[in-house]
Amino acid sequence: SGVFQLQLQEFINERGVLASGRPCEPGCRTFFRVCLKHFQAVVSPGPCTFGTVSTPVLGTNSFAVRDDSSGGGRNPLQLPFNFTWPGTFSLIIEAWHAPGDDLRPEALPPDALISKIAIQGSLAVGQNWLLDEQTSTLTRLRYSYRVICSDNYYGDNCSRLCKKRNDHFGHYVCQPDGNLSCLPGWTGEYCQQPICLSGCHEQNGYCSKPAECLCRPGWQGRLCNECIPHNGCRHGTCSTPWQCTCDEGWGGLFCDQDLNYCTHHSPCKNGATCSNSGQRSYTCTCRPGYTGVDCELELSECDSNPCRNGGSCKDQEDGYHCLCPPGYYGLHCEHSTLSCADSPCFNGGSCRERNQGANYACECPPNFTGSNCEKKVDRCTSNPCANGGQCLNRGPSRMCRCRPGFTGTYCELHVSDCARNPCAHGGTCHDLENGLMCTCPAGFSGRRCEVRTSIDACASSPCFNRATCYTDLSTDTFVCNCPYGFVGSRCEFPVGLPPSFPW
């Protein structure tokens, strides 16, 4: 669809005569008839296949034609067509004299014709005017013409229909060749696809309008590029949705089990060295002079009973001092000035002369010790508690306070690592020499059977439209990651039908 436009510019008829040579009375009141038809090698009379148009009287004898409407007519003259422009044409322009006001062909005498021109040729669609001038013996006509496409038609022969739009079906204007030119923010063959917020993740985000970003389930953040971890994940992160990858020092399904008690709680006091020994379990290695599970107790140097022969020990800032009983001397009261004649053996001990009576030795009854049998036996001296247990004197007996993981009178028994039921989800525990091992029931795995591998909710292919399926391990349900253009829990809705999301 297009328009052949003819712009009449000037008509010269100096003598004011008709084609017959007869003069017009009082002058030639001139109007034009135009016939546009298909290409003919020799332009002949016959139907104006492409259309006709007539003008009102435009002037008398010689005159210029204005560019706008003149006396109700239009200039340029419009010859619309509703077909593909063939690129060739024939054009007949007749100048007529109008004696009266009736310009219909049947109302005019046949000799009212002033002049007739006929041209034919090729003409491409375009904005540029072709200027032409036709001269006869008595008249001259200057005119220009062109073919342009109607609104919404484009291309070399006005055959491409393109109507600009900005609605659900497209967002574009038309280029001169009829191709679509998307409005800013839109893309795709028909410019129906919005260009999302810059950086919005290609798979995890989508949009319904330019510069928007909507997140698919399991993703968050301004650009939908940050996964949502497992609900309840305490000390962990994710790289895909609903994961809980534990930070260093944490374990368990929700990363809430402390595997680094030493770092997180610093339980050892007085500069002791802390060693992790399992979940919420640790061992403190005390510096000299300290004792206790957390090395919280200060040791007295007199606790080791360094004074012999009944000497009494006094703690001092820089060590200790022995106060010796009569007859003894030395740093630890280890030297004697007595002999068996002085009855030096206490608690029923028997005296034996040594070195020709220069000194002596006491043989002590059970439960007593010391060079003079002056001390009750300290049941802890022999360090009877195994595996780092702490020995405590309790009257006539003794007892061992065991470190975590040990039991028995002398802390000689290793507590079963399995006693704490460390295997989750009904796993079977096996004690090993240096730890334990869990045998997991079907559907679970991991060191402690803490990883659920049972039901693959994605096995039934619940996601539509080529969506990616993820299994949410906490609930044995699935999450569908929809491709562009689809939403819904199973990606079953095209974007045009907005679902309601739970957030």
Partner: antibody, heavy 121, light 110 residues
Framework: EVQLQQSGPELAKPGSSVKISCKAS????????ISWIKQTTGQGLEYIGY????????DYNEKFKDKATLTVDKSSRTVFMQLSSLTPGDSAVYYC??????????????WGQGVMVTVSS | DTVLTQSPALAVSLGQRVTISCKAS??????????IYWYQQKLGQQPRLLIY???TLASGVPARFSGSGSGTDFTLNIDPVEADDIATYFC?????????FGSGTKLEIK
């Protein structure tokens, strides 16, 4: 029950810095965002920035880029905001708020009680 | 920055319906959602979320609150108004960076 407990009021001198805190409880801390909002009588409510409490990633309003620094301590479930080079114009109530951020959707579903910061010589 | 314009104050009778408006300097809507949110702040307290994405009621908010609108014009409706609703109401947008708030509308009793 979601709760955000903010630290106490601050009185600071021009040119100095303050660090205010926001301790979260009652929800999965590492899967959310904490935003900070400034409220003054003249300017109303202004968005300062947010932090992803799981990854530590941050986003700032251009206006506050050189003023505020957001950090997180996951072990104590606490988010901090340091305000530097203080001027009297920084005197305001500062709120922390748990935030929902799903692409173009962003809103503040739980708010702390606010911290009054006064800058005066 | 996207500017959100609210009228400073509104006087209302208890039991009546009230409409609080928020006008944006640009469209805040897409075919899916409108990116506007409403908060209530009582004197001396922190703000509280009422409505998200223009019309969805936040958890624990009474049904007498509702939100509507699209493009650049949005409203928060309270019907009927109760004495407990006396507060300042703020709108907020998330369509463009930076996120911005309206200046607030103070609801007063006639």
């Amino acid at each position: 029950e979601v709760q955000l407990q903010q630290s106490g009021p601050e009185l600071a001198k021009p040119g100095s810095s303050v660090k205010i805190s926001c301790k979260a409880s009652g929800y999965t801390f590492t899967s959310s965002y904490i935003s900070w909002i400034k409220q003054t009588t003249g300017q109303g409510l202004e968005y300062i920035g947010y932090i992803n409490t799981g990854s530590g990633g941050t986003d700032y309003n251009e206006k506050f880029k050189d003023k505020a620094t957001l950090t997180v301590d996951k072990s104590s479930r606490t988010v901090f905001m340091q305000l530097s080079s203080l001027t009297p114009g920084d005197s305001a109530v500062y709120y922390c708020a748990k935030s929902i951020l799903l692409g173009s959707t962003y809103y503040l579903d739980y708010w702390g009680q606010g911290v009054m910061v006064t800058v005066s010589s | 920055d996207t500017v959100l314009t609210q009228s400073p104050a509104l006087a209302v009778s208890l039991g009546q319906r009230v409409t609080i408006s928020c006008k944006a300097s640009r469209s805040l809507s897409s075919p899916m959602y409108s990116y506007i949110y409403w908060y209530q702040q009582k004197l001396g307290q922190q703000p509280r979320l009422l409505i998200y994405r223009a019309s969805t009621l936040a958890s624990g908010v009474p049904a007498r609150f509702s939100g509507s609108g699209s493009g650049t014009d949005f409203t928060l409706n309270i019907d009927p108004v109760e004495a407990d609703d006396i507060a300042t109401y703020f709108c907020q947008q998330s369509w463009s960076d930076p996120f911005t708030f309206g200046s607030g509308t103070k609801l007063e009793i006639k």
